[in-house]
């Protein structure tokens, strides 16, 4: 989801944005800070064992609108929040996993053949 009522149309920022990165630091990052023309993000998702994993970093302007939209993916619990209002704004993002639905138990990946 977008924070602070931002419009969903991606527009070029006049200046580079610095974001905290964790588990998602590109080669050009320094001291766990990455740079982008798009958004900072923080994401929580379940790994293969069902453990929640938090990652954060930079999303380039290209394609970031789609990535920040947080469209539900079948059989995957994941939530992402994006921001641009200040440098390292994603330090203050705390997305939570969507609640388990009944069918996630019955129809989860473990039961697929």
């Amino acid at each position: 989801k977008k924070e602070d009522g931002e419009s969903t149309a991606p527009t070029a920022r006049p200046k580079v944005l610095r974001c905290k990165c964790h588990h998602h630091c590109p080669e050009d990052s320094v001291n766990n800070i990455c740079s982008t023309d798009g958004y900072c993000f923080t994401m929580i998702e379940e790994d293969d064992s069902g453990t929640p994993v938090v990652t954060s970093g930079c999303l380039g302007l290209e394609g970031s609108d789609f990535q920040c939209r947080d469209t539900p993916i079948p059989h995957q619990r994941r939530s992402i929040e994006c921001c641009t209002e200040r440098n390292e704004c994603n330090k203050d993002l705390h997305p939570t996993l969507p609640p388990l639905k009944d069918r996630d138990f019955v129809d989860g990946p473990i039961h697929h053949k």
Epitope: P14, K15, V16, R18, P26, E27, D28, S29, V30, I33, C34, S35, T36, D37, G38, C58, G60, L61, E62, R86, N87, E88
Partner: antibody, heavy 116, light 112 residues
Framework: QVQLQQPGAEVVKPGASVKLSCKAS????????MQWVKQRPGQGLEWIGE????????MYNQKFKGKATLIVDTSSSTAYMQLSSLTSEDSAVYFC?????????WGQGTTLTVSS | DVVMTQTPLSLPVSLGDQASISCRSS???????????LHWYLQKPGQSPNLLIY???NRFSGVPDRFSGSGSGTDFTLKISRVEAEDLGVYFC?????????FGSGTKLEIK
């Protein structure tokens, strides 16, 4: 038009500190980073660091950490760089420069002379 | 830090000649966003640098079309198709992909 005004020269004694100024006009001050660059006579350009006036977020070249401190006064659209414990090695021209994804406008530079 | 190596250090030319300056970086300047933040500046004696080319090949406003930039990855070139008297000075390449940002040592364009 974009302008970055810097004093022409400063003379200070070794061991002292100095605060160099850079007054911006012709654009929205908080929409761009302000960088500072050092140039010694006959030598190349060295990036000192940068500050985002909108949130006062700074990034420094490790080489200048402890030597340079970057600050801004958004009410007067002025950026400052404080240099401490000055030695002859700090004698140079210091430029401020507007930065978005690249530097597009530079100040005229302040010539700093450290001499007793 | 990324080292920017410029060649030649000095470039004597006749007015009207073509001039070519090379800039090589010690690592790729392709940013994680896909942009390449390699830029060219001209500094005339006693003045501050002026932006000529940004992001490899984009001419800054007011820069004559005799200036062109090209290259990718670690290897970049600035070309001046027909050198004029006002083009004389020191040319610097600069990268803003990796912190700390770094500059080439400069190429002095002078009259032969």
């Amino acid at each position: 038009q974009v302008q970055l005004q810097q004093p022409g020269a400063e003379v200070v004694k070794p061991g002292a500190s100095v605060k160099l100024s850079c007054k911006a006009s012709g654009y929205t001050f908080t929409n761009y980073w302000m960088q500072w660059v050092k140039q010694r006579p006959g030598q190349g350009l060295e990036w000192i660091g940068e500050i985002d006036p909108s949130d006062r977020y700074t990034m420094y070249n490790q080489k200048f950490k402890g030597k340079a401190t970057l600050i801004v006064d958004t009410s007067s659209s002025t950026a400052y760089m404080q240099l401490s414990s000055l030695t002859s090695e700090d004698s140079a021209v210091y430029f401020c420069a507007r930065f978005g994804y690249y530097v597009d406008y530079w100040g005229q530079g302040t010539t700093l002379t450290v001499s007793s | 830090d990324v080292v920017m190596t410029q060649t030649p250090l000095s470039l004597p030319v006749s007015l009207g000649d073509q001039a070519s300056i090379s800039c090589r970086s010690s690592q790729s300047l392709v940013h994680s966003t896909g942009n390449t933040y390699l830029h060219w500046y001209l500094q005339k004696p006693g003045q501050s640098p002026n932006l000529l080319i940004y992001k490899v090949s984009n001419r800054f406003s007011g820069v004559p079309d005799r200036f062109s930039g090209s290259g990718s990855g670690t290897d970049f070139t600035l070309k001046i198709s027909r050198v004029e008297a006002e083009d004389l000075g020191v040319y610097f390449c600069s990268q803003s992909t990796h912190v700390p940002f770094t500059f080439g040592s400069g190429t002095k364009l002078e009259i032969k």
